[in-house]
């Protein structure tokens, strides 16, 4: 059956921790991605942003988990209105910002 949202969120948090712990070297060779609004629909927005990073094995599992959390199909080059498409940030910063927000959601019990 489908993975419960709380389990998927925990899995995503744990994976984001895995790829950032004690990491000082630029993630994905310093690739830049669009910043997103950390609001409703952020899983799809995060995936839309990260899916445009290619050849970075460190975030493959993150992309897979986000695919499971986003209810619609996402492909490279696709952008929703949820993007703040005026700001690009490094993947490492994107991941850390996302991680801190997800932990806040988890503590508040907002799993969807």
């Amino acid at each position: 059956g489908p993975v419960p949202p709380s389990t998927a969120l925990r899995e995503l948090i744990e994976e984001l921790v895995n790829i950032t712990q004690n990491q000082k070297a630029p993630l994905c060779n310093g690739s830049m991605v669009w910043s997103i609004n950390l609001t409703a629909g952020m899983y799809c927005a995060a995936l839309e942003s990260l899916i445009n990073v290619s050849g970075c094995s460190a975030i493959y599992r993150t992309q897979r988990i986000l695919h499971g959390l986003c209810p619609h199909k996402v492909s490279a080059g696709q952008f929703s209105s949820l993007h703040v498409r005026d700001t690009k940030i490094e993947v490492a910063q994107f991941v850390k910002d996302l991680l801190l927000h997800l932990k806040k959601l988890f503590r508040e019990g907002q799993f969807n």
Epitope: E14, T20, N22, K96
Partner: antibody, heavy 126, light 109 residues
Framework: EVQLVESGGGLVKPGGSLRLSCAAS????????MSWVRQAPGKGLEWVGR??????????NYAAPVKGRFTISRDDSKNTLYLQMNSLKTEDTAVYYC?????????????????WGQGTTVTVSS | SYELTQPPSVSVSPGQTARITCSGD??????AYWYQQKSGQAPVLVIY???KRPSGIPERFSGSSSGTMATLTISGAQVEDEADYYC???????????FGGGTKLTVLG
């Protein structure tokens, strides 16, 4: 006051078991990644293992010499960290410290904060 | 298993600059942390994430990192800085911690 207090050390025979405890106070223990570090008499510091906070997965990692024999756990409701040591060897004789894990500091609320216990002595001898 | 290498000892006169090095293959991508341990006491963090100084640590302590080497610098070393210093980091996975063998700093008073 921010502090960690270890207990449970003592003399044990080779092959025996011991459980160390570390009581935390003065900070949000549930957010902290925690480590055990040991120091054999007259030797340097040796990393034993760590446990992440529950929200970060609660996963554990161990140094090769203790993997499979030692188990780290935590009880956030009691603000306590544990180290279960089985199949003890004479080379496990050391002062055991519990400490906040600096690698996990970014994810908790103790960035740049450093907390160590006073250490508890474990002697493994026949 | 992953190792961090430090010189066993460093000696300076009071007021001189002491530099303690730590080398490890993963240091280009993983942060280094430095601890001071005085005899019979628990270690104290003096530098975290290569170059950040915790509150309460004197400004004479600084850290840097370049390539596979991290360096702890004590500018104007004082007699009270005499201690063992340990670098700490993780392997490339970030999952396993490791300490260097330690460096005994002697401040010749």
């Amino acid at each position: 006051e921010v502090q960690l207090v270890e207990s449970g050390g003592g003399l044990v025979k080779p092959g025996g078991s011991l459980r160390l405890s570390c009581a935390a106070s003065g900070f949000t223990f549930s957010n902290a990644w925690m480590s055990w570090v040991r120091q054999a008499p007259g030797k340097g510091l040796e990393w034993v293992g760590r446990i992440r906070s529950e929200i970060d997965g609660g996963t554990t990692n161990y140094a090769a010499p203790v993997k499979g024999r030692f188990t780290i756990s935590r009880d956030d409701s009691k603000n306590t960290l544990y180290l279960q040591m089985n199949s003890l060897k004479t080379e496990d004789t050391a002062v055991y410290y519990c400490a906040t894990d600096q690698v996990g500091a970014y994810y908790g609320d103790y960035y740049g904060m450093d907390v160590w216990g006073q250490g508890t002595t474990v002697t493994v001898s026949s | 298993s992953y190792e961090l290498t430090q010189p066993p000892s460093v000696s300076v006169s009071p007021g001189q600059t002491a530099r303690i090095t730590c080398s490890g293959d993963a240091l280009p991508e993983k942060y280094a942390y430095w601890y001071q341990q005085k005899s019979g006491q628990a270690p104290v963090l003096v530098i975290y994430e290569d170059s950040k100084r915790p509150s309460g640590i004197p400004e004479r302590f600084s850290g840097s990192s370049s390539g596979t080497m991290a360096t702890l610098t004590i500018s104007g070393a004082q007699v009270e800085d005499e201690a063992d210093y340990y670098c700490h980091s993780t392997d490339s996975s970030g999952n396993h911690g490791v300490f260097g063998g330690g460096t005994k700093l002697t401040v010749l008073g």
